[in-house]
Structures are given as structure tokens and as C-alpha cells.
């Protein structure tokens, strides 16, 4: 029987830059219940606080709700782990909420097979981005990227569509049903998750680009 | 509606021992620091101790250290405070505050009153 | 340990006056400090943190300001429910201090 092992914070996300959420892995037990607490304080400040949910995140994780959260100012956080043999802790981690964003993916993915008559035929593509991020404030620039694929293919075809909310994709298969997905990623942080897959199936006599 | 109620004041002897609780209802109790703060008749307030969500960090003020021991039960939405070796001083009304800690204290108790006399 | 001194210690003042309160810090505090209210045999109720944020359901003819070590806390337009006893308080540090208290009284 022994002390803990040493805890490590390994990731910190926020989904909007007004709440975010740590998670820590535990050292070896010692063999014992063990018990885990993350403490805080934000530069500058004197007095360390205790992480207000440990519920929220799942196991081992801290979650700072609105009220707790503040961007521009760097949070300095360790985790505490103690059992009847000792206590170890984990190196502090310096934390920036805006560095640490992480968005849900784009929403309403909408695809369709265009054919203009005096153009070629392409394929367009129109999203939202996620509800809970607020672009109207001007702290978000969201760039999206879109992947697409045969159903059947095993690699995918990755386009950067910058800042915009649609886009046109001309080179595809005619007859192939392909699947389509959306991610989005703030100017400083992290790529969502991809958007569910949307199919579309792609006209037989679809001209290709030449 | 968030409520604090307190209980286990009284009278007591110098040198006695009184445990004081706090019911927390309408919040999600856990979540909070706690905090006991006192006031001596016709006097100020006196912050007298702290405890984080999950006691990982415990403050008091230099008059109590020693002699009180606070401590909480988040499963019990209750927060404690054990007072031994009581001296005429302590007494007051002691109130259990609700800490947000992006604020301040913004939830009180109504109080409950601590004599030491002989 | 921080020192709070708050000024005056009495106030007599009448309903529509504008009434400032000081609180000065022994040291630097940032804006680590709130007021309260409190009237007899009634617990402190919370009306300014962080030197300057009105709580939730506070007036707003209660306004706060300062940083450092010198805060005021400003009622523009006292009412009759406002005579009471004041006090300032920091979080900066252990142990957490609170001022002597301002008590407001009809003129």
C-alpha cells in the first residue's frame, strides 16, 4: 500500500468560451480508495478556489460554469490526489479559456446537385454554425472545412471553406452516392467533431468538370 | 429559493462545546464554498472560517484556529462548525454564507445565537 | 492581515440624499471587495462584488467603484428602505476582513 501516483490534467476544452472543462487522469491508486481535488486561481489572484462541478464532465474532470469562467485572464490549476498512505499532485496547468475552445460541429448540413443550364452542374452545400456559439459578439471567427466521399471509397476529399457557410464543389462522380460532413474550428482552438454525415446521391448524367 | 438555515446555538460555559450545523436547501450545495462569519452583539462582522466543495482547502481566522473545526457534508447539503474550548468572546451570532466564488458571499443564513457565560 | 477602514462610521441623511461611503485597505486588493447591507436583527444581505457589480435584484441607485486600496460605495437617491448598517469586505486574502461598517441613519 501506498501514496498515490501523480494525477496529470490532460485536456481542458470550452465549447464557447463561457464555460469550459478539465479532465485529469489519476496516478496509480497505492492500493487505496483514493480521493481527487483540483484547485485554481487565476494570475494575479492570491486566494485558490475548488473546482465548483465535479459532475458535470464525467469522471475525474472539473467543470467551470459561466460564472466562474473569464476570458483574458490565465487560470493556474493543479490536481490533488490523497489517500490514507499521502497526497501527490499533479503539475500545475496554465489554462487561457480562448486558446481552449473546441465547438460543437456545424449544424443543418444541407447538400444539393445544382444544374444550371448555361453551367456546369456542382454540388452545394450550406451549414449553420453551432447554437452555442454567438458570432454577433465579434470574439469568434469560425472557419469550417468540408470532407466528402464516395459511400464506398475509403479516403475522404477534404476542402477548406475559410469563414463562409456554403460552398460549391464542381469534380465529382456521376451515379456515386456520396457522404458529406462539416467541421468548424475558432481562429485560436480546437476542430469540432464532424457534422453527422449527410447523403446525396449524384445524377447519372452529371457532367463532370473538366 | 435558496435557503440556509442554522442550528445548535445556545448556551454555554466557558470552556464548553457547542456544534453548530447549516441546512442548505434550492442549490446545488456542493458546488459552493462555505463560510461561517459571526457578529458580537452591537459589533461588526467576522469572517471566522472557509471550507471549498470538496474541503481540499480550509481556512480560519487566527481567533478560532485550534479551537473550531469546520466541515461539511455535501451528501447532507450541511455545513458544521465544532466549537471547543469556548471563551467569552465567541460570543456573537454566527451565520453560514453561501460563497460564489466569482462573487462574494450572496447567500446568508438568518443566524443563530452563541452565548458563553458562567 | 488586510485592514478595512470604512468612513464615516455614522451618517444621518435624508430620504432623496446621495450618499458616499468609503473604504480604504491597508494594502492592494485589485477589486477584490464587496459591500452589504445590513439592518437590525436581519443577516447582510450582498449588493456590490468585485468593487462594482450590482447583484442580482439590488437597486440600481446602489453603484460601487474603486480598486487598490480606496472604494466607494454610492447610494444616488437614498429611500426610506436603505437606512441601515453598511459593510465593505475582501476576498483578496486570508483571512477574509470586513470594514467596521457604516451605519446610515435618518436625518
Known amino acids: 500500500q501506498l501514496p498515490p501516483g501523480k494525477p496529470e490534467i490532460f485536456k481542458c476544452r470550452s465549447p464557447n468560451k463561457e464555460t469550459f472543462t478539465c479532465w485529469w487522469r489519476p496516478g496509480t491508486d497505492g492500493g487505496l480508495p483514493t480521493n481527487y481535488s483540483l484547485t485554481y486561481h487565476r494570475e494575479g489572484e492570491t486566494l485558490m478556489h475548488e473546482c465548483p462541478d465535479y459532475i458535470t464532465g464525467g469522471p475525474n474532470s472539473c467543470h467551470f460554469g459561466k460564472q466562474y469562467t473569464s476570458m483574458w485572464r490565465t487560470y493556474v490549476m493543479m490536481v490533488n490526489a490523497t489517500n490514507q498512505m499521502g497526497s501527490s499532485f499533479s503539475d500545475e496547468l496554465y489554462v487561457d479559456v480562448t486558446y481552449i475552445v473546441q465547438p460543437d460541429p456545424p449544424l443543418e448540413l444541407t447538400v444539393e446537385v445544382k444544374q444550371p443550364e448555361d453551367r456546369k452542374p456542382y454540388l452545394w452545400m450550406k451549414w449553420s454554425p453551432p447554437t452555442l456559439i454567438d458570432l454577433k459578439t465579434g470574439w469568434f471567427t469560425l472557419l469550417y472545412e468540408i470532407r466528402l466521399k464516395p459511400e464506398k471509397a475509403a479516403e475522404w476529399e477534404t476542402h477548406f471553406a475559410g469563414q463562409q457557410t456554403e460552398f460549391k464543389i464542381l469534380s465529382l462522380h456521376p451515379g456515386q452516392k456520396y457522404l458529406v460532413q462539416v467541421r468548424c474550428k475558432p481562429d485560436h482552438g480546437y476542430w469540432s467533431a464532424w457534422s453527422p454525415a449527410t447523403f446525396i446521391q449524384i445524377p447519372s448524367d452529371f457532367i463532370m468538370n473538366d | 429559493e435558496v435557503q440556509l438555515v442554522e442550528s445548535g446555538g445556545g448556551l454555554v460555559k466557558p470552556g464548553g462545546s457547542l456544534r453548530l450545523s447549516c441546512a442548505a436547501s434550492?442549490?446545488?450545495?456542493?458546488?459552493?464554498?462555505m463560510n461561517w462569519v459571526r457578529q458580537a452583539p452591537g459589533k461588526g462582522l467576522e469572517w471566522v472560517s472557509s471550507?471549498?466543495?470538496?474541503?481540499?482547502?480550509?481556512h480560519y481566522a487566527d481567533s478560532v484556529k485550534g479551537r473550531f473545526t469546520i466541515s461539511r457534508d455535501n451528501a447532507k447539503n450541511s455545513l458544521y462548525l465544532q466549537m471547543n474550548s469556548l471563551r467569552d468572546e465567541d460570543t456573537a451570532v454566527y451565520y453560514c454564507a453561501r460563497w460564489d466564488a466569482a462573487a462574494a458571499f450572496d447567500y446568508w443564513g438568518q443566524g443563530t445565537l452563541v452565548i458563553v457565560s458562567s | 492581515d488586510i485592514q478595512l477602514t470604512q468612513s464615516p462610521s455614522f451618517l444621518s441623511a435624508s430620504v432623496g440624499d446621495r450618499v458616499t461611503i468609503t473604504c480604504w485597505a491597508s494594502q492592494g486588493i485589485s477589486s477584490y471587495l464587496a459591500w452589504y447591507q445590513q439592518k437590525p436583527g436581519k443577516a447582510p444581505k450582498l449588493l456590490i462584488y468585485v468593487a462594482s457589480t450590482l447583484q442580482s435584484g439590488v437597486p440600481s441607485r446602489f453603484s460601487g467603484s474603486g480598486s487598490g486600496t480606496e472604494f466607494t460605495l454610492t447610494i444616488s437617491s437614498l429611500q426610506p428602505e436603505d437606512f441601515a448598517t453598511y459593510f465593505c469586505q475582501q476576498l483578496n486574502s486570508y483571512p477574509l476582513t470586513f470594514g467596521g461598517g457604516t451605519k446610515v441613519e435618518i436625518k
Open positions: 471550507i471549498s466543495t470538496r474541503s481540499s482547502l480550509i
Open positions: 434550492g442549490i446545488t450545495f456542493s458546488s459552493y464554498s
